[in-house]
């Protein structure tokens, strides 16, 4: 079954995928999606790197490590629940069905804040102030209306939260590795 | 791997109640919510309610409310649906189902157990 | 509640012929949809997620799109694999609620 990592709202995400390249500098294209990886390419595309430099992103999502070295991990941004789901990394490898494609399971964690009573009211779009807590999306978020102006990151600094407090280190060998040439 | 095994449905008698479990495996339930689903024969999927085991918290589909209680078991692994009142229109099977993680879509499902309502 | 409105409630396919599910929701739902096949005699299984994200282990045959109250699941070539029932649901808000099905059945 897929890997799984976990992060909290609020917090960066962090979806290890790595290469070797062959030689220093011969980089291999690769793409990131949202959605299971398909027969070809990938769907919903966050992130795209070509032989030489990343040629195309969105917002939120980047590579954090050294993709010319074969880290191309990818980070994402300040997560929301909305962020939960598979991730596709794909090593685009020449050759006719030669790719190494990578399934990645996110899952975003409600942030637990226990301020000040709150209130649990029907979404609107029309909320002055909101912040995510345990729930599923819009239908379940509360307002922290009496709370002075703070962001997210204040809440919870904590790192990335990986499955079974695995170490960053020791993703490497979590199977999204592959070696070229 | 992730596993769903519900047990404890059967024939009961209109107005009686009903407690069915629901065995995990493969995940630590505390991790993500657990949802009960039902389907009357020959028809289609409603949701009854889900759980977050951490701590408790519940929420019912409105219909359910009074007349369903969801209920986790950590230390077993395990989720409950007790049902109550029951009648002739709860005949169904029952699915347990763990979400994605926190977010109101199945990726997982359990077998079915199967609730008649009958005298 | 929201209320989903799939169509058609059946529908027959030939192998190997594109074949197209529509789901209506009563209000605006985002991209918050989801799509399940129910083989016969099984459980329902995840096919796509948010609208247009195909779950893993799921054929690339198989596409969502939309967004507010409109959705639509393509297959663009049907197998004899894909006989069952098709369910839309939205996730948006509570109480989460299910398309009537839509079944698909080879001609």
């Known amino acids: 079954s897929e890997v799984e990592y976990r992060a909290e709202v609020g917090q960066n995400a962090y979806l290890p995928c790595f290469y070797t390249p062959a030689a220093p500098g011969n980089l291999v294209p690769v793409c990131w999606g949202k959605g299971a990886c398909p027969v070809f390419e990938c769907g919903n595309v966050v992130l795209r790197t070509d032989e030489r430099d990343v040629n195309y992103w969105t917002s939120r999502y980047w590579l954090n490590g050294d993709f010319r070295k074969g880290d191309v991990s990818l980070t994402i941004e300040n997560v929301t629940l909305a962020d939960s789901g598979i991730y596709c990394c794909r090593i685009q490898i020449p050759g006719i069905m030669n790719d190494e494609k990578f399934n990645l399971k996110l899952v975003i964690k409600p942030a637990k804040v226990t301020p000040a009573p709150t209130r649990q009211r029907d979404f609107t779009a029309a909320f002055p102030r909101m912040l995510t807590t345990r729930g599923h999306g819009p239908a379940e978020t509360q307002t922290l209306g009496s709370l002075p102006d703070i962001n997210l990151t204040q809440i919870s600094t904590l790192a990335n939260e990986l499955r079974d407090s695995r170490l960053a280190n020791d993703l490497r060998d979590s199977g999204a590795t592959i070696r070229i040439g | 791997e992730v596993q769903l095994v519900e047990s404890g449905g059967g024939l009961v008698q209109p107005g009686g109640s009903l407690r069915l479990s629901c065995a995990a495996s493969g995940f630590n339930i505390k991790t993500t919510y657990m949802h009960w689903v039902r389907q009357a024969p020959g028809k289609g999927l409603e949701w009854v309610g889900r759980?977050?085991?951490?701590?408790?918290?519940?929420k019912y589909a409105p219909k359910f409310q009074g007349k369903a209680t969801i209920s986790a078991d950590t230390s077993k692994n395990t989720a409950y649906l007790q049902m109550n009142s029951l009648r002739a229109e709860d005949t169904a099977v029952y699915y347990c189902?763990?979400?994605?993680?926190?977010?109101?879509?199945?990726?997982?499902w359990g077998q079915g157990t199967l609730v008649t309502v009958s005298s | 509640d929201i209320v989903m409105t799939q169509s058609p409630l059946s529908l027959p396919v030939t192998p190997g012929e594109p074949a197209s599910i529509s789901c209506r929701a009563s209000q605006s739902v985002d991209n918050y949809v989801a799509w399940y096949l129910q083989k016969p005699g099984q459980s329902p299984q995840l096919l796509i997620y948010y609208a247009s994200n195909r779950y893993i282990g799921v054929p690339d045959r198989f596409s969502g799109s939309g967004s507010g109250t409109d959705f639509t699941l393509k297959i663009s070539r049907v197998e004899a694999e894909d006989v069952g029932v098709y369910y839309c649901q939205q996730h948006y808000s509570s109480p989460y609620t299910f398309g009537q099905g839509t079944k698909v059945e080879i001609k």
């Open positions: 759980i977050d085991p951490a701590d408790d918290n519940t």
């Open positions: 189902v763990r979400d994605f993680g926190y977010v109101a879509w199945f990726a997982y």
